[in-house]
């Protein structure tokens, strides 16, 4: 899909399993043509997405794409949930697909769940 509109490249129904206590960077890949748009992150609470105001964010610039990063330093158990990034572009609000973080509480390294185990957890809501 090639255009000069802003594009937010988060895949639909993307998921990440992460460990509480670890650092984690959640990336929102942003494509734009001229001026970099204003991008924000929000966390879904039911059907409402609550803007994350006081969280550390940063930009990473690459050749063809930029990344707006939400930092988790460290990941906390209540970071579990779904997140969305949004861009303001020419008075339009462009929203990404949501991406879901599944946070596992701190365990010893040998007890870390595999991605397959995480994917089978009954508490994953769909």
């Amino acid at each position: 899909k090639e255009s000069c509109d802003v594009q937010l490249y988060i895949k639909r129904q993307s998921e990440h399993s992460i460990l509480a206590g670890d650092p984690f960077e959640l990336e929102c890949p942003v494509k734009y043509c001229a001026n970099r748009p204003h991008v924000t992150w929000c966390k879904l609470n039911g059907t409402t997405c609550v803007k994350l105001e006081d969280r550390q964010t940063s930009w990473k610039e690459e050749k063809n794409i930029s990344f707006f990063i939400l930092h988790f330093e460290p990941v906390l158990p209540n970071d579990n949930g779904s997140y969305r990034c949004s861009a303001n572009f020419q008075s339009n609000l462009i929203e990404s697909h949501s991406t879901t973080l599944y946070v596992t509480d701190v365990k010893s390294a040998s007890e870390r769940p595999s991605k397959d185990e995480m994917a089978s957890r009954p508490w994953l809501l769909y």
Epitope: K1, Y9, I10, K11, R12, S14, E15, H16, S17, T47, H97, S98, K115, D116, M118, A119, Y126
Partner: antibody, heavy 119, light 112 residues
């Protein structure tokens, strides 16, 4: 254009495992989801599971949880599906497929791999 | 899991006639993003399936415009306005809204 090429037919004994490969071309698989579907002789389609090659995150149908393992090697654009503890009912054509993770703008299937489980 | 029920199981038509296949879902396929992830596949004997329709009504590249999809919520239809000889095949609906992904049982379109 996006293409998928699967490994060749396999004959396995009950209790054994099989690992089928699926190599993609014409796309960066990190921008996709890749999934596996099987079709027993004369039957319909059955979804096994999918992988996000960007981070390795997998989803499985409950029926295959613990018995199927889907993995991805982004360096070779190849996805694998391993099925363990094979039984005769697992005899089927196994298809891999790939779709665009952002807009679902394409959905392409491999040619299929026949796995025969027989003693 | 979502159950998709197709009807009829077999549809006999003559070339040039209209063919209509129904797919009913056990729950709504409307996703939280406002889109409905209902697809239609065509499978010919000895071949891999091929996607014809996605997001209920969008035709894949190269799919003739005699194929159309419609519906919303739980009820969906694939219509072939004038069946051509190459259209005789098995058609499947499948949903991409919830996990696990599920397929209808298939509808065989055969020559009358």
């Amino acid at each position: 254009q996006v293409q998928l090429v699967q490994s060749g037919a396999e004959v396995k004994k009950p209790g054994a495992s099989v690992k089928v490969s699926c190599k993609a071309s014409g796309v960066n698989i990190k921008d996709t989801y890749m999934y596996w579907v099987r079709q027993a002789p004369g039957q319909g389609l059955e979804w096994i599971g999918r992988i996000d090659p960007a981070n390795g995150y997998t989803r499985y149908a409950q029926k295959f949880q613990g018995r199927a393992t889907i993995t991805a090697d982004t360096s070779t654009s190849t996805v694998y599906m391993e099925l363990s503890s094979l039984r005769s009912e697992d005899t089927a054509v196994y298809y891999c497929a790939v779709y665009d993770g952002y807009y679902e703008s394409f959905d392409v299937w491999g040619q299929g791999t026949l796995v025969t489980v027989s003693s | 899991e979502i159950v998709l029920t197709q009807s009829p199981g077999t549809l006999s038509v003559s070339p040039g006639e209209r063919a209509t296949i129904s797919c009913r879902s056990s729950q709504s396929l409307l996703d939280s993003d406002g889109k409905t992830y209902l697809n239609w596949l065509q499978q010919k004997p000895g071949q891999a399936p091929r996607r014809l329709i996605y997001l209920v009504s969008k035709r894949d590249t190269g799919v003739p415009d005699r194929f159309s999809g419609s519906g919303s919520g739980t009820d969906f239809t694939l219509t072939i306005s004038r069946v051509e000889p190459e259209d005789f095949a098995v058609y499947y609906c499948w949903q991409g809204t919830l996990f696990p992904r599920t397929f209808g049982q298939g509808t065989k379109l055969e020559i009358k």
